[in-house]
């Protein structure tokens, strides 16, 4: 008998075609050869089974000898044998109907678990394979599972349930729910104002939840709550803000933080964290600050930076147009009775400029002059 | 919801062929079938025939047998129809429709944004 | 094939207006018939199938009916977006035939 597969909820079309291409009667039945549908002339009549409402026909293939049966909006117990009885002839179909969900929401944080469960009929033995965005392959029976979700990970899954050599193929969208970057560097010379931007990388109708910016100094021996806030529909509203220092937030995403000034006191890290609601856990995004400053006093031009630099920056002191004074893998370098002229700082890595300050030194009898 | 996306206007020659494609979105390729239907400008409309897009089984219009073809690619949700030996009078709006049967009939349920077809020398 | 000949072929009122469009088949089709609306530039759309029942989301103005030969689409009362063409299609047999189209203008 011929094996048919069908998705929970979709429609199914069984065909069941007679030797003569012309209207004559026909019936569909079960296995329990109760009557579903059939005709009466050009009329559909319909039997006493379980599909009433949801079976259909396709009159107009009649008049070709074809007699479909349609079931709509399937639900896995309508696995069954179809008979379909025509010409005193009985062809039979098979129906299996099996159904993919996602055990919990389709939309998840960053780190959690996905599970596929495979809903089949009794008797049936299927294989599942589904195929995530990124091209990975995850293989099983009745449940699958993936753990530690990545932002790669969002998109369309595809999975292929197969029985009898056939097989029926699901889509399941899922969002990951994550910040744009895990982490982020801002470099900024003192003085200048800081903007932390915190996109997100999944866009959903309402957004609702709250969030906390907790940063730790290099200075300091204890991290602190520097804000808090509410997100509600996307909007935001700053719940608690620190006064030193004063941060600004902006009131619709992406998340958007103004330091008004950049000072090394300010200088480390901090961590973003975003309680969704209706979501257990939290989305992580880490942001460091960098800062530097020029200074000369009397005899000596000094150039710092504080905050998290990697070990292969590089600190250079030099006089503009110049080869570097001074260039070292540390957090200061200075220069001990500088030339008259604009000097220049720069933070890099592998000769890129990450940050760059410029100060004036003036003939020794004059001040120094900050640009 | 249903979407039916089909492909932009298209201007041909006389003798030539035209592909139009109708991509579906926001329902699975399966239980209805895809129905072509034109309309020549200032006209009415002309039924011209159904692909299964599960299946792939065809029906035509009597009047087009032999110059239309309806295929379809189950990977995209994609249904093609492709008219050959173009005349002027082909020159229309041509759209995909997906059916809906209700008690043993098709309608015509969702419609594609239709695409012009204009055959000129 | 079944002709479907509406009547009128076209026709003006006012917003408020009841209005009723015919469409008579060359054989008999049940009620196995369907009106579709549509305004320039854009694709039909269904209203009224097997005869008499509305298309979901299509407003309780619109009413159909009709059975074997002869059909009836009427608009109890115009609304403004109301004025478009309508067609009837016959379901029954291939090949699928469409009246040549009433359009409802404004008066």
């Known amino acids: 008998k011929k094996v048919v597969l069908g998705k929970k909820g979709d429609t199914v079309e069984l065909t069941c075609t007679a030797s003569q291409k012309k209207s004559i009667q026909f019936h569909w039945k079960n296995s329990n050869q109760i009557k579903i549908l059939g005709n009466q002339g050009s009329f559909l009549t319909k039997g006493p089974s379980k599909l009433n409402d949801r079976a259909d026909s396709r009159r107009s293939l009649w008049d070709q000898g074809n007699f479909p049966l349609i079931i709509k909006n399937l639900k896995i117990e309508d696995s069954d044998t179809y008979i379909c009885e025509v010409e005193d002839q009985k062809e039979e179909v098979q129906l299996l109907v099996f159904g993919l969900t996602a055990n919990s929401d389709t939309h998840l944080l960053q780190g959690q678990s996905l599970t596929l469960t495979l809903e089949s009929p009794p008797g049936s033995s299927p294989s599942v394979q589904c195929r995530s965005p990124r091209g990975k392959n995850i293989q099983g029976g009745k449940t699958l599972s993936v753990s530690q979700l990545e932002l790669q990970d969002s998109g369309t899954w595809t999975c292929t349930v197969l029985q009898n050599q056939k097989k029926v193929e699901f889509k399941i969208d899922i969002v990951v729910l994550a910040f744009q970057k895990a982490s982020s560097i801002v470099y900024k010379k003192e003085g200048e104002q800081v903007e932390f931007s915190f996109p997100l990388a999944f866009t959903v109708e309402k957004l609702t939840g709250s969030g906390e910016l907790w940063w730790q100094a290099e200075r300091a021996s204890s991290s602190k709550s520097w804000i808090t806030f509410d997100l509600k529909n996307k909007e935001v509203s700053v719940k608690r803000v620190t006064q030193d220092p004063k941060l600004q937030m902006g009131k619709k995403l992406p998340l958007h933080l103004t330091l008004p000034q950049a000072l090394p006191q300010y200088a480390g890290s901090g961590n973003l964290t975003l309680a969704l609601e209706a979501k257990t856990g939290k989305l992580h995004q880490e942001v460091n600050l960098v800062v530097m400053r020029a200074t000369q006093l009397q005899k000596n031009l000094t150039c710092e930076v504080w905050g998290p630099t990697s070990p292969k920056l590089m600190l250079s002191l030099k006089l503009e147009n110049k080869e570097a004074k001074v260039s070292k893998r540390e957090k200061a370098v200075w220069v001990l009775n500088p030339e008259a002229g604009m000097w220049q700082c720069l933070l890099s890595d592998s000769g890129q400029v990450l940050l760059e300050s410029n100060i004036k030194v003036l003939p020794t009898w004059s001040t120094p002059v900050q640009p | 919801q249903v979407q039916l996306v089909q492909s932009g206007a298209e201007v041909k020659k006389p003798g030539a062929s035209v592909k139009v494609s109708c991509k579906a979105s926001?329902?699975?390729?399966?239980?209805?079938?895809m129905h072509w239907v034109r309309q020549a400008p200032g006209q009415g409309l002309e039924w011209m025939g159904w692909?299964?897009?599960?299946?792939?089984?065809?029906q035509y219009a009597q009047k087009f047998q032999g110059r239309v073809t309806m295929t379809r690619d189950t990977s995209t949700s994609t249904v093609y129809m492709e008219l050959s030996s173009l005349r002027s009078e082909d020159t229309a709006v041509y759209y995909c429709a997906k059916d809906i049967v209700h008690d043993g009939t098709e309608y015509f349920q969702h419609w594609g944004q239709g695409t012009l077809v204009t055959v000129s020398s | 094939d079944i002709q479907m000949t509406q009547s009128p072929s076209s026709l003006s009122a006012s917003v408020g207006d009841r209005v009723t469009i015919t469409c008579r088949a060359s054989q008999n089709v049940n009620t196995w018939l369907a009106w579709y609306q549509q305004k320039p530039g854009k694709a039909p759309k269904l209203l009224i199938y097997?005869?008499?029942s509305l298309q979901s989301g299509v407003p309780s103005r619109f009413s159909g009916s009709g059975s074997g030969t002869d059909f009836t689409l009427t608009i109890s009362s115009l609304q403004p977006e109301d004025f478009a063409t309508y067609y009837c299609?016959?379901?029954?047999?291939?090949?699928?035939?469409f009246g040549q189209g009433t359009k409802l203008e404004i008066k």
């Open positions: 692909i299964d897009p599960n299946g792939g089984g065809t």
């Open positions: 299609q016959q379901a029954n047999s291939f090949p699928f035939t």
């Open positions: 926001g329902s699975t390729f399966s239980g209805y079938y």
């Open positions: 097997e005869a008499s």
